[in-house]
Structures are given as structure tokens and as C-alpha cells.
Amino acid sequence: ELCDDDPPEIPHATFKAMAYKEGTMLNCECKRGFRRIKSGSLYMLCTGNSSHSSWDNQCQCTSSATRNTTKQVTPQPEEQKERKTTEMQSPMQPVDQASLPGHCREPPPWENEATERIYHFVVGQMVYYQCVQGYRALHRGPAESVCKMTHGKTRWTQPQLICTGEMETSQFPGEEKPQASPEGRPESETSCLVTTTDFQIQTEMAATMETSIFTTEYQ
């Protein structure tokens, strides 16, 4: 079963994952004017075991205008752990192994990728919230949401975060950016959907849980 809804929307805040649990899907989306290659992957899948997790199936986009004549073969998840790459990309480095066991890092971008990434998360996945530029956190509660399974149904926990304009109020004494916390153990392996819009996330999993949870590069 997959999460019936998206993580909660918090006004003036965005969310993202620090790492992705095994079973997470990332749809292969192409930007306008491009499409998935025929007989190419439909989505990437975080797969592996407790000691090593990686993204299987590389997304590839081709121009909608030109006919795709070259036959492309999807890399085999089992036998072929070294990814095939498109001609214009350098071979993929093994950056997709997350520090957290059973998790994958943010997948590297692919050529002509859409500006929006659509993820399908598994139960136990945590997403973290941060106020957008020009806003700051008003309440210091947990700024995360977890996809949980309760009585056979999936739900997202409600993050305790309120974002307010910088001009409206000053930061509360002692207030700081929310820190990453270890993810809860899953109750079952079911998936949830999340979209990350308007920017390409290139966030590395924090080497320790002491650093700020957001290191987003805008491309």
C-alpha cells in the first residue's frame, strides 16, 4: 500500500528527505520538450540490503522532436551495479550509498530532468521542513513528518512548525534551525508520494546528525 496522501503542507515552508528508505521510487520525469527514452526506465528505485543501498534503473530523457533510434537497455539491478550512463555524462560515482543503513542519498540529476521530482515514499520515511527564504520558524516543535501505518492505513504525522515573515516578528531567544534526528523504524514497507518542486535538490546526507539538515543548492 502506498500513502494515500502527500506530507502535510505548511504555509511558507518546504520539505525534503535527508535520505530515502529502500523501496522509495523516484519517477523518471523529463523537462518540457523531452521524454523518457523508449524501453527506458519508468522510475528509479532505492534498493539493496542493510549494508548497501543504491538507486537502480537510470532515468534518461531524449528530445521529443527527434526520433529515438538507438536501442537503450535498462541496467540490471542484480548483476550490474555499475550504472550505464548517457554519452554526455561522466560515469556515475558511488555517491548513492547513504550513511544511514538501508537508505539511498539524493539521486544525482540526469540530463534534461524535469524541475519537479516526484517521489513515492515508504512507511518510516521522514521528511524535514524548513521555512522558505524571507520567513523564519515561530514555534520550536519537531519540524518533521513521518509516514506511518496505523490500523492498516497510512498517514503523515503533523510537523510542529509555523513560519512567519521576518518583518512580522524577531527570532525567539534560543531558536535555531531544526536538527536532523534519526529516522524511526518502519512498521511496514509501504510507499508514500512526495513532490519536490521548483528546484533541483543536491543535498548530501549529513555525515553526522549534528550539522544543519538543509544544504540545498539551487541550480
Partner: antibody
């Protein structure tokens, strides 16, 4: 509740056209691929094709390429399977199914029975 | 593309275990871990019971297990119950980004 609701049974004559539907609800239906599967009376399952409602990207089984058309209208979360000229051999139950994680079809519609007879 | 090969029927008594094989090629079953199994009760749509060769969706009994060796996948049902009587289908994702189903196996609980 996550579900796929298919249109009702159809009885048609050979040569007629037909379009059956599959509406997704209870989930973000434009971001999951929807497949179509045929089951002829007393026979097994046959994969026909799949569509991504978000951008209408479609893949067909070689056996069904050119025989049917798969389409979608993402504004109403609906996928379609259509024939321009039905044959008696198209008589079957047609299921739509959502593609979940690990390339498995996790949610299935109840099926649409299509009967083609003169 | 040819259907995956399954035995047409198997039968066993309650409490026993049965195994259904599913043989494909190096372009489907042998190429990926993306093998799934479906149970179809009479007059009902198929239901996913195993994916990724051996993983169970929530709500599926641990009496259902799966494995794969080379181009052949297997479904094992232990502690057979009367309500396991159904048709079982294997399916595999293929190298050409299509899917193929097995011909189906009718399980009879004696």
C-alpha cells in the same frame, strides 16, 4: 481509499468501436503508471500496455501494438483503453492496474467485461 | 514475447506445502529481481501477494514466500488452507520495459 474504478460491461458487434475507462482515486493518480491486462474467458493474464497519466507516455506489448490504443486524461484521473474496430476475439475481461514499487501491479480494478458478438 | 512457463495445476491437502515454478529467460526473470506473484480467486481481480521475488505487501500471510534462481522463480505456500484455492500468476518486468505474465497455475486444495 485507494482504488481504481472501471467502467461497466459492454456488449458490442464486430467492427464497432469502444473505449473503456479506469478512474484512479485516493492517491496522486497522475504520478503512477496504469497498466491494462486482458483475460480471455478461461485463460490467463496478458499484459497489454501501460500509460503514465502525467504526460501520457505509453508502452505497449508487441502483441497488442496497433490493435488497441491506450490514453489518459490526467484532469479527471482516468486512463482509457480503446478499439477502433472490435473483433469477436476481443471478448475478454479487461483489468486496469496501478504500477507500484518494484515494478509490480499493486492495485487492481474490478475489471470490465467486453463481449463482442454478432 | 512468450508467456512465462508455469505448471497448469497443482494440488495438495490442507496443511501441506506446495511450490509453483515460473520459468522465463535471461531477458525477464533472469535479468531482474522484479518478479511478482498474483493470486486470483474465482470471479475476482488478481491480487498482489509477492513482489521483488520474495517481499510481501502488508496484509499478506507469511505462509507465502518466494525465491529465484537463474531464469526460474518459485512461489511456495506453506500450511495450505482451503481459501488458498485460486489461480496463481507470476509476472516479470523485462529488458524492453514491458511486462510478461505466466500462463497461470490452478491450485486445488483437496
Amino acid at each position: 481509499q485507494v482504488q481504481l474504478v472501471q467502467s461497466g460491461a459492454e456488449v458490442k458487434k464486430p467492427g464497432e468501436s469502444l473505449k473503456i475507462s479506469c478512474k484512479g482515486s485516493g492517491y496522486s493518480s497522475t504520478s503512477y503508471w496504469i497498466g491494462w491486462v486482458r483475460q480471455m474467458p478461461g485463460k490467463g493474464l496478458e499484459w497489454m500496455g501501460i500509460i503514465y497519466p502525467g504526460d501520457s507516455d505509453t508502452r505497449y506489448s508487441p502483441s497488442f501494438q496497433g490493435q488497441v490504443t491506450i490514453s489518459a486524461d490526467k484532469s479527471i484521473s482516468t486512463a482509457y483503453l480503446q478499439w477502433s474496430s472490435l473483433k469477436a476475439s476481443d471478448t475478454a475481461m479487461y483489468y486496469c492496474a496501478r504500477l507500484g514499487s518494484a515494478y509490480a501491479f499493486d492495485i487492481w480494478g474490478r475489471g470490465t467485461m467486453v463481449t463482442v458478438s454478432s | 514475447q512468450s508467456a512465462l512457463t508455469q505448471p497448469a495445476s497443482v494440488s495438495a491437502s490442507p496443511g501441506q506445502s506446495i511450490t509453483i515454478s515460473c520459468t522465463g529467460t535471461s531477458s525477464d526473470v533472469g535479468a531482474y529481481i522484479y518478479v511478482s506473484w498474483y493470486q486470483q480467486l474465482s470471479g475476482k481481480p488478481p491480487k498482489l501477494i509477492l513482489y521483488d521475488v520474495s517481499k510481501r505487501p502488508s496484509g499478506i500471510s507469511d505462509r507465502f514466500s518466494g525465491s529465484k534462481s537463474g531464469n526460474t522463480a518459485s512461489l511456495t505456500i506453506s500450511g495450505l488452507q482451503a481459501d488458498d484455492e485460486a489461480d496463481y500468476y507470476c509476472s516479470s518486468y523485462t529488458r524492453s520495459s514491458t511486462w510478461v505474465f505466466g500462463g497461470g497455475t490452478q491450485l486445488t486444495v483437496l
